[in-house]
């Protein structure tokens, strides 16, 4: 089914307008901002969600060290251009004709330029590192319990195939979730790791995109997991192209 039939809402995307005007009177939902039809049985693409958001009123070491090419989304919100499939267009420009290239999760991967800037292809983000710091608890979490709970979360809540959760690392109080998905691995119908990471980020920030509750509160074997901060690193299949000036 496309959406919840009983009251015609989109369980996986609250930033939609739904009406029973689909084939045979079925409930059909369109994303705010773009008006594109969305499949409510899975996650909506990050590009359409950002567009909707902008249109809405208002050694023994086990932790991963992000690679020198890892990107962090420092630019924040912008109103993106999405292709007909809801993916980010490789080149994004603002209203003052400043343009830049983005990766498949919409994060800038080049210096900003003008309208002459070329972005030949949409470069895929194939590795995402979600870095969480949790608040003090009654005791350290058991690593295997934590691993199982986070894998369950990504499988059940975000519908991400388990093979794309590459690892869960834990060194109290830091938790790292590694998501990996190469172009060749992603089959039709598979949730994109970028979309799953975005839904997770919004959940942690108490801004759930799912219909219903405002956020996501995790517990591991009954123990409340209260997140103190979240950092997300993005690794692309082709390293980003920034001038040396930005790196100093």
């Amino acid at each position: 089914h496309t959406a919840a039939q009983d009251n015609c809402t989109c369980p996986t995307n609250k930033m939609t307008v739904c009406s029973p005007d689909g084939p045979g009177g079925r409930c059909q939902c369109r994303a705010l901002g773009s008006g594109m039809a969305v499949d409510c049985s899975t996650l909506t693409s990050k590009c359409l969600l950002l567009k909707a958001r902008m249109s809405a009123p208002k050694n023994a070491r086990t932790l991963v060290r992000p690679s020198e090419h890892a990107l962090v989304d420092n630019d924040g919100l912008y109103d993106p251009d999405c292709d007909p499939e809801g993916r980010f267009k490789a080149r994004q420009c603002n209203q003052t004709s400043v343009c830049w290239c983005v990766n498949s999760v919409g994060v800038r991967r080049t210096d900003k330029g003008d309208l002459s800037l070329r972005c030949d292809e949409l470069v895929r983000t194939h590795h995402i590192l979600i870095d969480l710091r949790h608040r003090p608890t009654a005791g350290a979490f058991n690593h295997s319990d934590l691993d199982a709970e986070l894998r369950r979360l990504f499988r059940e809540r975000y519908r991400l195939h388990p093979k794309f959760v590459a690892a869960v690392h834990y060194e109290q109080p830091t938790i790292q979730i590694e998501l990996r998905q190469n172009t060749s691995q992603k089959a039709a119908g598979d949730v994109d790791i970028g979309d799953a990471a975005y839904y997770f980020e919004r959940d942690i920030k108490g801004e759930s995109l799912f219909q219903g509750r405002g956020g996501l509160d995790l517990r591991v074997r009954g123990e409340p997991l209260q997140v103190e901060r979240t950092l997300i690193y993005y690794l692309d299949e082709i390293p980003p192209k920034f001038s040396m000036k930005r790196l100093t």
Epitope: A138, G215, P224
Partner: antibody, heavy 119, light 106 residues
Framework: QIQLVQSGPELVKPGASVKMSCKAS????????IHWVKQKPGQGLEWIGY????????KYNEKFKGKATLISDKSSTTAYMEVRGLTSEDSAVYYC????????????WGQGTSVTVSS | DIQMTQSPSSFSVSLGDSVTITCKAS??????LAWYQQKPGNAPRLLIS???SLETGVPSRFSGGGSGKEYTLSITSLQNEDVATYYC????????FGGGTKLEIK
């Protein structure tokens, strides 16, 4: 249905200790922590701490460290709180509470145990 | 520790009126906010969690709003049974309650 049933009122002398209970039923006891909350007469609510019955791990509000001790007994699905070195400041109603199934808010509450400290 | 400041501390209202209670956190609590209703001699009752989500069985005249550090509880068309003390509580960093707002009928 889910229930938290607390022990009856207590009248105790200054300097003594008191131990109250909170019997949980209607759900798997080890799946949720049990919180304890204090309410002095005519005043607001104050979080004391929680115990995780799964592993007996405890977390306390700094203010209540050394004052309250939380324990649990899986076999009887009961949580206990002992308050020691009682003074008039400890005269209050003490509630146990269980979190909501989806959030860390407190969804199910015991009826409260009234403690009066008086010589 | 996160401080929760609730205002006003008391409210005198007429039946059928609307009322809004405000709760301010000392830092961003990312919508990890609950509202409770407590009647004399009773335990608190959870009305709203996640800042806006109404719990099962809570009348629709209650609603929660806000984000960041500032949150509100609104009650429209006040009924006799709404006379109580209302508390906000943050659960982003441990658990802290606001001082309470006592609702009385004029």
């Amino acid at each position: 249905q889910i229930q938290l049933v607390q022990s009856g009122p207590e009248l105790v002398k200054p300097g003594a200790s008191v131990k109250m209970s909170c019997k949980a039923s209607g759900y798997t006891f080890t799946t949720y922590v049990i919180h304890w909350v204090k309410q002095k007469p005519g005043q607001g609510l104050e979080w004391i701490g929680y115990i995780n019955p799964n592993n007996d791990g405890t977390k306390y509000n700094e203010k209540f460290k050394g004052k309250a001790t939380l324990i649990s007994d899986k076999s009887s699905t009961t949580a206990y709180m002992e308050v020691r070195g009682l003074t008039s400041e400890d005269s209050a109603v003490y509630y146990c509470a269980r979190p909501h199934f989806e959030t860390h808010a407190m969804d199910y509450w015991g009826q409260g145990t009234s403690v009066t400290v008086s010589s | 520790d996160i401080q929760m400041t609730q205002s006003p501390s008391s409210f005198s209202v007429s039946l059928g009126d609307s009322v809004t209670i405000t709760c301010k956190a000392s830092e961003d609590i990312f919508n990890r906010l609950a509202w409770y209703q407590q009647k004399p001699g009773n335990a608190p009752r959870l009305l709203i969690s996640g800042a806006t989500s109404l719990e099962t069985g809570v009348p629709s005249r209650f609603s929660g709003g806000g984000s960041g550090k500032e949150y509100t509880l609104s009650i429209t068309s006040l009924q006799n049974e709404d006379v109580a003390t209302y508390y906000c509580q943050q659960y982003w960093n441990t658990w802290t309650f606001g001082g309470g707002t006592k609702l009385e009928i004029k």
